[in-house]
């Protein structure tokens, strides 16, 4: 449905407030180093222009595409070359190449200072003094640090952020009210960003077909009562939404997401019995709620899958007529019966089924050839089940911090070339799978754990892609999206790695560690552990555990000492010497 002016169309659909917020997010995600004030100025200029187009869609330049309008605006930034270097070359290109060029320069790990939370009174004053600027700053700071954050969802986070300040800045104990809410938003925000990053990587690195397969599996688990045609329609619409957001088309994305939520709520009866509460909420909450809704109950008495997909004589005929539709139906039928499987496992099973049909439908006796295809699924199902059982056992034995340490050692031995901050960040996140998923009953453990691990390993993949240092990481990240986790799990010690030279400075600690938060102190110790393994990759777990126990005791002792700095200096030297002896250095 063509509009004379795309910018006017989106302005009218979204309303001024959402329009401005989404343009700010888009600009901050593209130009991640630009100061806040510069972005606000650009957004105001675009908004004023949009208003002229709303008034008269035939006005000059109103017929231009959003990419042209936004790209032209970004290219007016005076310091583009000094700040962004070769990204400035994008401005010499024409659309759509210019937008593709901007997308390629998005930085998953921008060199930006850590966001430090001011005192509660300072934040409340800023909030009251200028609420609009305060909330815009939130959008800007999150968007520039998370250039693939799902924009319509960021509007929902901003709404909750505003509600937290509105409520808590009037409370008797502002800090007790506000800080837990901000912590929750921060943690949920990081998780949301990482989940969306995987969707964008799936689309951009593996294509629309890969994303659609993921969506068929996930939506079929969530809406097992829905017909295949209904699930297919939802998948098509959802793919459009995420393709737009991942491509920087945030206005279209937000608009289409709203349309999809509207459609789902108008057709609840044929989709899921679990949507009622979601559909009573306002737009942003509604969309979020639908995205997180629990799986509906499976229809009773679903027939065996074997009848249509193994026993039928028409398997090859049906497959040949419309391969992707037939495979989509297989995936739908399997997924709706298995909410207890991870999406990536379901996709592995579908891939195995596809490979078998490709081979067997060309054989002399196809039916005889594919008759045992379901037997091939058993080891694929058992592999993640075993892995989760083992790791949950270890998590329950160790607790989160020590479980993270076990993963740090494991991944450093597998891919020691990866930077220490990346190994620490990724392993800490991998370790959170324990608290997140091991508490669940068996039927919910695998979808929780393996699909979460896919999100975390994608963080490793995107960070590594920026500065590739390990062929093994590149291989596991690029060969198959659904086999990333099994690929990393199967890696043994990298025998080609030359151990890092010992550097005393790396293992020198000071009294400042005593004033750090528990989390920051853990990160310091985990950084030292990674460096230790890089220095001594053949050290056994028992050896490393002994060194880490000594290290924890050393920090505790020196933080209790009267002269902390002297203690760290003297005891630190002894610890390094003892550790070198223990590890046979």
């Amino acid at each position: 449905d063509a509009h004379k002016s795309e910018v006017a169309h989106r302005f009218k659909d979204l309303g001024e407030e959402n329009f401005k917020a989404l343009v700010l997010i888009a600009f901050a995600q593209y130009l991640q180093q630009c100061p806040f004030e510069d972005h606000v100025k650009l957004v105001n200029e675009v908004t004023e222009f949009a208003k002229t187009c709303v008034a008269d869609e035939s006005a000059e330049n109103c017929d231009k595409s959003l990419h042209t309008l936004f790209g032209d605006k970004l290219c007016t930034v005076a310091t583009l070359r000094e700040t962004y270097g070769e990204m400035a070359d994008c401005c010499a290109k024409q659309e759509p190449e210019r937008n593709e060029c901007f997308l390629q320069h998005k930085d998953d790990n921008p060199n930006l200072p850590r966001l430090v939370r001011p005192e509660v009174d300072v934040m409340c004053t800023a909030f009251h003094d200028n609420e609009e600027t305060f909330l815009k700053k939130y959008l800007y700071e999150i968007a520039r640090r998370h250039p693939y954050f799902y924009a319509p969802e960021l509007l929902f986070f901003a709404k909750r952020y505003k509600a937290a300040f509105t409520e808590c800045c009037q409370a008797a104990d502002k800090a007790a009210c506000l800080l837990p809410k901000l912590d929750e938003l921060r943690d949920e925000g990081k998780a949301s960003s990482a989940k969306q990053r995987l969707k964008c990587a799936s689309l951009q690195k593996f294509g629309e077909r890969a994303f659609k397969a993921w969506a068929v599996a996930r939506l079929s688990q969530r809406f097992p009562k829905a017909e295949f045609a209904e699930v297919s329609k939802l998948v098509t619409d959802l793919t459009k939404v995420h393709t737009e957001c991942c491509h920087g088309d945030l206005l279209e994305c937000a608009d289409d997401r709203a349309d999809l939520a509207k459609y789902i709520c108008e057709n609840q009866d044929s989709i899921s019995s679990k949507l009622k509460e979601c559909c009573e909420k306002p737009l942003l909450e509604k969309s979020h709620c639908i995205a997180e809704v629990e799986n509906d109950e499976m229809p009773a008495d679903l027939p065996s899958l074997a009848a249509d997909f193994v026993e039928s004589k028409d398997v090859c005929k049906n497959y040949a007529e419309a391969k992707d539709v037939f495979l989509g139906m297989f995936l739908y039928e399997y997924a709706r019966r298995h909410p207890d499987y991870s999406v990536v496992l379901l996709l592995r099973l579908a891939k195995t089924y596809e490979t078998t049909l490709e081979k067997c439908c060309a054989a002399a006796d196809p039916h005889e050839c594919y008759a045992k295809v379901f037997d091939e699924f058993k080891p694929l199902v058992e592999e993640p089940q075993n892995l989760i059982k083992q790791n949950c056992e270890l998590f329950e034995q160790l607790g989160e911090y020590k479980f993270q340490n076990a993963l740090l050692v494991r991944y450093t031995k597998k891919v020691p070339q990866v930077s220490t901050p990346t190994l620490v960040e990724v392993s800490r996140n991998l370790g959170k799978v324990g608290s997140k998923c091991c508490k669940h009953p068996e039927a919910k453990r695998m979808p929780c754990a393996e699909d979460y691990l896919s999100v975390v390993l994608n963080q490793l993949c995107v960070l590594h892609e920026k500065t590739p240092v390990s062929d093994r990481v590149t291989k596991c990240c690029t060969e198959s999206l659904v086999n990333r986790r099994p690929c990393f799990s199967a890696l043994e010690v990298d025998e080609t790695y030359v151990p890092k030279e010992f550097n005393a400075e790396t293992f020198t600690f000071h009294a400042d560690i005593c004033t750090l938060s528990e989390k920051e102190r853990q990160i310091k110790k985990q950084t030292a552990l990674v460096e230790l393994v890089k220095h001594k990759p053949k050290a056994t777990k028992e050896q490393l555990k002994a060194v880490m126990d000594d290290f924890a005791a050393f920090v505790e002792k020196c933080c209790k000492a009267d002269d902390k700095e002297t203690c760290f200096a003297e005891e630190g030297k002894k610890l390094v010497a003892a550790s070198q002896a223990a590890l046979g250095l």
């Epitope: 075993n386 892995l387 059982k389 083992q390 034995q397 076990a406 494991r410 043994e492 056994t540 777990k541």
Partner: nanobody
């Protein structure tokens, strides 16, 4: 330290059986998981089977499932690998390993202590 010594290897015909033993000394055996790995001639070392510290969880490579059985006797500080329906492709040096986590992982680097190995040859 834990010392591990494998025994029970030898030459056997296809379809035959062997029982490998792994005797442990030095530390409390019951706090360790035990794994069996093998290295076929000219190939990488590969996982065969593992059993956790208490003996209630066992894991097998797909290639040996249904043919091999891992077990342990903590009172005797010994682990076992019962191998039946042996095939020529089972020919390898078999190693016993101990894992201080007590889990019984699939990856060889998770194991702290290793035996020297015992040769198993399946040939007619």
């Amino acid at each position: 330290q834990v010392q591990l010594v494998e025994s029970g290897g030898g030459l056997v015909q296809p379809g035959g059986s062997l029982r490998l033993s792994c005797a442990a000394s030095g530390r409390i055996f019951s706090t360790y998981a035990m794994g069996w790995f093998r290295q076929p001639p000219g190939k990488e070392r590969e996982f065969v089977a593992s059993i956790n510290r208490s003996g209630d969880s066992t894991y097998y490579a797909d290639s040996v499932k249904g043919r091999f059985t891992i077990s342990r006797d903590n009172a005797k500080n010994t682990g076992y690998l019962q191998m039946s329906s042996l095939k020529p492709e089972d020919t390898a040096v078999y190693y016993c390993a101990a894992d201080s986590d007590g889990i019984g992982w699939f990856n060889s680097f998770e194991y702290d202590y290793w035996g020297r190995g015992t040769q198993v040859t399946v040939s007619s």
